[in-house]
Amino acid sequence: HTVELNNMFGQIQSPGYPDSYPSDSEVTWNITVPDGFRIKLYFMHFNLESSYLCEYDYVKVETEDQVLATFCGRETTDTEQTPGQEVVLSPGSFMSITFRSDFSNEERFTGFDAHYMAVDVDECKEREDEELSCDHYCHNYIGGYYCSCRFGYILHTDNRTCRVECSDNLFTQRTGVITSPDFPNPYPKSSECLYTIELEEGFMVNLQFEDIFDIEDHPEVPCPYDYIKIKVGPKVLGPFCGEKAPEPISTQSHSVLILFHSDNSGENRGWRLSYRAAGNECPELQPPVHGKIEPSQAKYFFKDQVLVSCDTGYKVLKDNVEMDTFQIECLKDGTWSNKIPTCKIVDCRAPGELEHGLITFSTRNNLTTYKSEIKYSCQEPYYKMLNNNTGIYTCSAQGVWMNKVLGRSLPTCLPECGQPSRSLPSLVKRIIGGRNAEPGLFPWQALIVVEDTSRVPNDKWFGSGALLSASWILTAAHVLRSQRRDTTVIPVSKEHVTVYLGLHDVRDKSGAVNSSAARVVLHPDFNIQNYNHDIALVQLQEPVPLGPHVMPVCLPRLEPEGPAPHMLGLVAGWGISNPNVTVDEIISSGTRTLSDVLQYVKLPVVPHAECKTSYESRSGNYSVTENMFCAGYYEGGKDTCLGDSGGAFVIFDDLSQRWVVQGLVSWGGPEECGSKQVYGVYTKVSNYVDWVWEQMGLPQSVVEPQVER
């Protein structure tokens, strides 16, 4: 009878064991274990009847198609075999064991005691068959194994071979190299590779196989295993395989598909090909006069590009348009995309106008072409070139007028300051009385007229100021403050301010320049109680033209000490002392209550301590601060009552040889003007130089040299 065994281990004994087995007996044990295991059989006891070639009693071990062993007897002889210590190993997961005894036994035989167990098959070691073994890596586990692939490869659906994903290769460059995967190492199995060469229309792809060509083939059948096919439009070239590379292929197409197929076996090194684009040839090129062509080649083909450029100082001219370079291209029909342009000398054209300046040409015929030279100069004596620039500009290769220091920027003509068109009188002789000023003696003098038309009746008053530049007037803050507010400082509205420059005689305003205000800027810390920081600026609506009667005064250097005691300074004014005079009377009628002609007075600077003491000795809150200085005579007699508020107190600066505004007429009192020991108080301008430059939007370094010269 047959016994089916399915356990992973077990014991088999002869019938009746350990007693003697019966005669004429036959038992078969079929052992089946799971796939991935084999069966190991060994005997602990064996005692059967001996016979030649085990004809009588025996134990036979077999698989489905193979006898693994036949055992009988007690000990091994030449013609019979006992298992002894031998282990029987099945090749697969099945083993059949048959015990047979014949009809007679001369002795009592005890039979056998056998054991079996399932043991793991190490498929990775034992698979010799290429068809079954792993392509790259094999991993054994109890009861089975699995395969894996090297980096860049994918396990095929057969779970054994390693393929690559190579169906998405696009080549658009005009030349390139294409190889089988992993070349020159053996190419992967079970792969379908697709390479597309897609060039611009007009190109034709030429293919050339190189180096090694090794694709699995067959002696009789053409390329049944692995192969290359080349598809050009509807036409297919190939298949190609073996060890002989195809001849160079001229596809006559800009689009080519290369298919490479490998099956699941074989170890071949693969292939490599280079491709290049071919196109139509274009005619030879001649560079233009004063120009060159890059790159310079013997031949040019479709898609080749050349850049036409000109020598320094020349520009490419194409269809009347100037450019730095011009590119032309070889077209697919073998013609150039454009004619070669010409090279034209660079022209900087007419140089830019210089405000308050003029231009002279150094080159004959007023040439404005490359390397021509011009010279800018300022309208002297009213303007001077900033930083003493040479003013020389050369026409550059870029087509712009260039100066060595300023580059393409134009020079700046700054108003000359503190240089009247006629000399101010010598300060050696002390003049006690005020006197008429000659025209042009105080060209910075400004008459400021404020007419507040927003009130009924209209409020109107006057003050003086000093021209600092073509656009800015310096004056006292109290001149531009609206007195209808006492607890706060409110500047007058710019619409209510008119400035007169170049005015000499108030009866004749025809020669004067009048300007509206664009901005009124009071010092933010101006104090109406003690007139500390009594300084302000008016920006004019338009810059005024400078000339002999309109020129700026210089600002001082930043010096907290201010003007030195006993220095003589000049103050000018029209002496508008009658508060009931109207603007029309001032500007037109020349009422007798004021001086028609600009007056000036010479006054010495008073030591600060002396002035402070003189005011402290009076009853009242008079405060001579560090932002003020005093001028006048101890004995009185002359003062700036006749000079308008905000007017400039100027001192001649020996270093720069210019007149500098050191003070602004601010306040005085309480006794009548010109009283004994009543000094006029002036805003110390040198304390505000930075503030003034900041308001005017000019860095100090720009204008400082005016005074430093």
Partner: antibody, heavy 116, light 112 residues
Framework: QIQLVQSGSELKKPGASVKVSCKAS????????MSWVRQAPGKGLKWMGW????????TYADDFKGRFVFSLDTSVRTPYLQISSLKAEDTAVYFC?????????WGQGTLVTVSS | DVLMTQTPLSLSVTPGQPASISCKSS???????????LNWLLQRPGQSPKRLIY???KLDSGVPDRFSGSGSGTDFTLKISRVEAEDVGVYYC?????????FGQGTKVEIK
């Protein structure tokens, strides 16, 4: 110290004129305007107007236009109030006060009596 | 003209007690420059007026800090935290925002 010293009391007949002065000291005179304020007997204060001490331009409240004139003598730091064609209802104390709108310091007042 | 209305018109206060005077204007006193020109003054019996407060809440120098001003727009208040004998007199508010400047009718403060 800041002081506003007004002229003394006046007794005037109807139709006459009067000029009240207000001498200022202790500060920069042209820095502040000068206001004039009337106080009728037993009544409250009424602002008459002000004069800009820098420009000399006066501004009058509507009730004080015509017979009332503000003026200045800057050299002696003195504003003046002149009333012409006096009427009995002009009887009042007239104050000067420093400032157009500030009125931070006041004179001691001048009593003007109009009586026949 | 801007009408200034003070309340109460008279006030009798025990020394050491607080006092409060209200002043209302017929239109806002905030001017185009963002300032409010509302002031308070005291006229003691037989004397000329003396300004106490300007720009609503700023105290003039020499004015005791028991005085304080507050308000905005059209409603303003003068407060005395502890009234003293020297505080008697007539208190006026006035505005300097809209021409012509106008005074309140006055509030008479007496000591009980």
């Amino acid at each position: 110290q800041i002081q506003l010293v007004q002229s003394g009391s006046e007794l005037k007949k109807p139709g006459a004129s009067v000029k009240v002065s207000c001498k200022a000291s202790g500060y920069i005179f042209t820095s502040y305007g000068m206001s004039w304020v009337r106080q009728a007997p037993g009544k409250g204060l009424k602002w008459m107007g002000w004069i800009n001490t820098y420009s000399g331009v006066p501004t009058y409240a509507d009730d004080f236009k015509g017979r009332f004139v503000f003026s200045l003598d800057t050299s002696v730091r003195t504003p003046y109030l002149q009333i012409s064609s006096l009427k009995a209802e002009d009887t009042a104390v007239y104050f000067c006060a420093r400032g157009g709108e500030a009125m931070d310091y006041w004179g001691q007042g001048t009593l003007v009596t109009v009586s026949s | 003209d801007v009408l200034m209305t003070q309340t109460p018109l008279s006030l009798s206060v025990t020394p050491g007690q607080p006092a409060s005077i209200s002043c209302k204007s017929s239109q806002s006193l905030l001017d185009s420059e963002g300032k409010t020109y509302l002031n308070w003054l005291l006229q003691r019996p037989g004397q000329s007026p003396k300004r106490l407060i300007y720009l609503v809440s700023k105290l003039d120098s020499g004015v005791p800090d028991r005085f304080s001003g507050s308000g905005s727009g059209t409603d303003f208040t003068l407060k005395i935290s502890r009234v003293e004998a020297e505080d008697v007199g007539v208190y006026y508010c006035w505005q300097g925002t809209h021409f012509p400047w106008t005074f309140g009718q006055g509030t008479k403060v007496e000591i009980k």
